[in-house]
């Protein structure tokens, strides 16, 4: 609390500007008017104020507006805005994308906050969904933003904002955050032709059942390992050896690479070495010549 | 480490026929379709012949058909090539090359073996 | 057949230099390409396969990329030891073809 004392003869601040770097807190606090500061945000910016007179200035904005700064502020707090708590941005309603943007682009370069958490969180909410611009605007500022949202909030994502969504933004995803995203991205891309669509759905396809990995497989693709690599376990696991080697096209030699690894280690167990030999690969692993093959999960659905 | 050794190489009149060997180790041989490529001197890389896994399938340049022959012994890890009806612009360096998958691209080369077709 | 012109056929540059090679097919191939290098005296050795994946050991200054047509080798920082002739090869049907050769020269 900075403590109330009357401001000195001629230093009452008639507007926000320069000359006001020179005020020690107390006079700050005694010769800037709230109201004032209000109207004038949009100059603190300009001022290189200290932390210490942020508080003050803060402080004033905080008693002139106990409820909640209007959007009108909030949209010009720039630096003013590392200085709110989360507390202080649950009691706002910002409802503008460039007020949005405005603060996002002071955080800019950093880690999300919990004070941007908080503004993203209010805003989101605000709007009732993820529309596409919002989405656009968060990924632009923190490309990990889509993946650190859970899948009941990625849920409410309509599939019109996918177009928004580049690879990059998805690099942090988990699988169950891309087995509610890639619906979304098969929906929203259903039109486009068969290169096209591949190229705007690779990176959704950690979340591609089965069906759709064999339904590829017979477009010419060509699949990247990385891509091959970050598919679902459970899905890789029916393919067959041609569907694979059709899925992945002249990327199939990387399979070499990364034959201890997951999916393709397990992908390996399932199949018949006949088969993996056919790929020229050297593959190992497969089952031998002569043995029986027992689904058992078709077994268990019968018993 | 993969290596991959040819022999057989030297000088032969034009008709004349030549044998190439390639001698594979530090691999599976029997897993891998091979291939062989040439190199006339102070000119580019061209493909002769190919060889699927088991040797059922084999594959040549319009340049080298009915005359060069391509075949494998898995039990050996040897690849062959008969040449037949040489003639000048056969000479080459002859490379045997690993294919990195059955459909895949040329992963290890061999140091080559300088035929030369001269009378 | 498939016919690959590669350019230019040669080039001088010196080293640190980022080196552009370009491949073009008189079909379409996908990603069916590789790119290899060759040293005087030496036997090809593997650099790129399907387009742009990168043979185990070879240094990440070399890349590629393209599909169908058009395709690209990139040397982003020219070494010593780069100074050398590099094919592209199509491997998408038989008879399988190689491009001309670029030759890169020291300046």
């Known amino acids: 609390e900075v403590e109330k004392t009357a401001c000195p003869s001629g230093k009452k601040a008639r507007e926000i500007d320069e000359s006001l770097i020179f005020y020690k807190k107390w006079e700050l606090e005694a010769c800037v008017d709230a109201a004032l500061l209000a109207t004038q945000m949009d100059r603190v910016n300009a001022i290189p104020f200290t932390y210490e007179q942020l508080d003050v200035l803060k402080h004033k904005l905080d008693e002139l507006y106990p409820q909640g700064y209007p959007e009108s502020v909030i949209q010009h707090l720039g630096y003013l805005f590392l200085k709110m708590s989360p507390e202080d941005i649950r009691k706002w309603n910002v409802t503008s994308l460039e007020t949005l943007k405005a603060l996002l682009e002071v955080n800019k370069g950093h880690e999300m906050s919990p004070q941007v958490a908080t503004l993203i969180d209010r805003f989101v909410k605000g709007r009732g969904q993820l529309d596409k611009d919002t989405l656009d605007t968060l990924t632009a500022f923190y490309p990990g933003y889509l993946c650190s949202l859970s899948p009941e909030e990625l849920s409410s994502v309509p599939p019109s904002s996918i177009w928004a969504v580049r690879p990059q933004d998805l690099d942090t995803c988990d699988p169950r955050q891309l087995d509610v995203l890639y619906p979304k991205a098969r929906l929203a891309f259903q039109n486009m032709n068969g290169s096209e669509y591949f190229v705007k759905i690779q990176s959704f396809l950690g979340g591609a059942p089965t069906e759709d990995l064999k339904a590829l497989s017979q477009q010419n693709v060509s699949m990247d390992l990385a891509t091959f690599m970050k598919l679902r376990t459970d899905a890789v696991l029916p393919l067959t050896v041609a569907e694979v080697q059709k899925l992945l096209g002249p990327h199939v030699e990387g399979l070499k690479a990364e034959e201890r690894h997951r999916p393709v280690r397990d992908w390996i167990l399932r199949q018949r070495q006949d088969d993996l030999d056919t790929l020229g690969l050297g593959l190992q692993g497969g089952i031998p010549n002569g043995y029986l093959v027992l689904d058992l999960s078709m077994q268990e659905a019968l018993s | 480490e993969v290596q991959l050794l040819e022999s057989g190489g030297g000088l032969v009149q034009p008709g004349g026929s030549l044998r190439l060997s390639c001698a594979a180790s530090?691999?599976?041989?029997?897993?891998?379709?091979m291939t062989w490529v040439r190199q006339a001197p102070g000119k580019g890389l061209e493909w002769v012949s190919g060889?699927?896994?088991?040797?059922?399938?084999?594959y040549y340049a319009d340049s080298v058909k009915g005359r060069f022959t391509i075949s494998r012994d898995n039990s050996k890890n040897t690849l062959s090539l008969q040449m037949n009806s040489l003639r000048a612009e056969d000479t080459a360096v002859y490379y045997c090359?690993?294919?990195?998958?059955?459909?895949?691209?040329?992963?290890?080369w061999g140091q080559g073996t300088l035929v030369t077709v001269s009378s | 057949d498939i016919q690959m012109t590669q350019s230019p056929s040669s080039l001088s540059a010196s080293v640190g230099d980022r080196v552009t090679i370009t491949c073009r097919s008189s079909?379409?191939?996908?990603?069916?390409l590789a790119w290899y290098q060759q040293k005087p005296e030496k036997a090809p050795k593997s650099l790129i396969y399907?387009?742009?994946s990168l043979q185990s050991g070879v240094p990440s200054r070399f890349s590629g990329s393209g599909s169908g047509t058009d395709f690209t080798l990139i040397i982003s920082s020219l070494q010593p030891e780069d100074f050398a002739t590099y094919y592209c090869?199509?491997?998408?049907?038989?008879?399988?073809?190689f491009g001309g050769g670029t030759k890169v020269e020291i300046k």
């Open positions: 530090g691999l599976t041989f029997r897993n891998y379709a």
């Open positions: 060889i699927s896994v088991s040797g059922g399938s084999t």
């Open positions: 079909q379409g191939i996908g990603s069916w």
């Open positions: 090869q199509q491997y998408n049907s038989y008879p399988l073809t």
């Open positions: 399907a387009a742009s």
């Open positions: 090359v690993k294919r990195g998958a059955a459909v895949g691209s040329f992963d290890y």
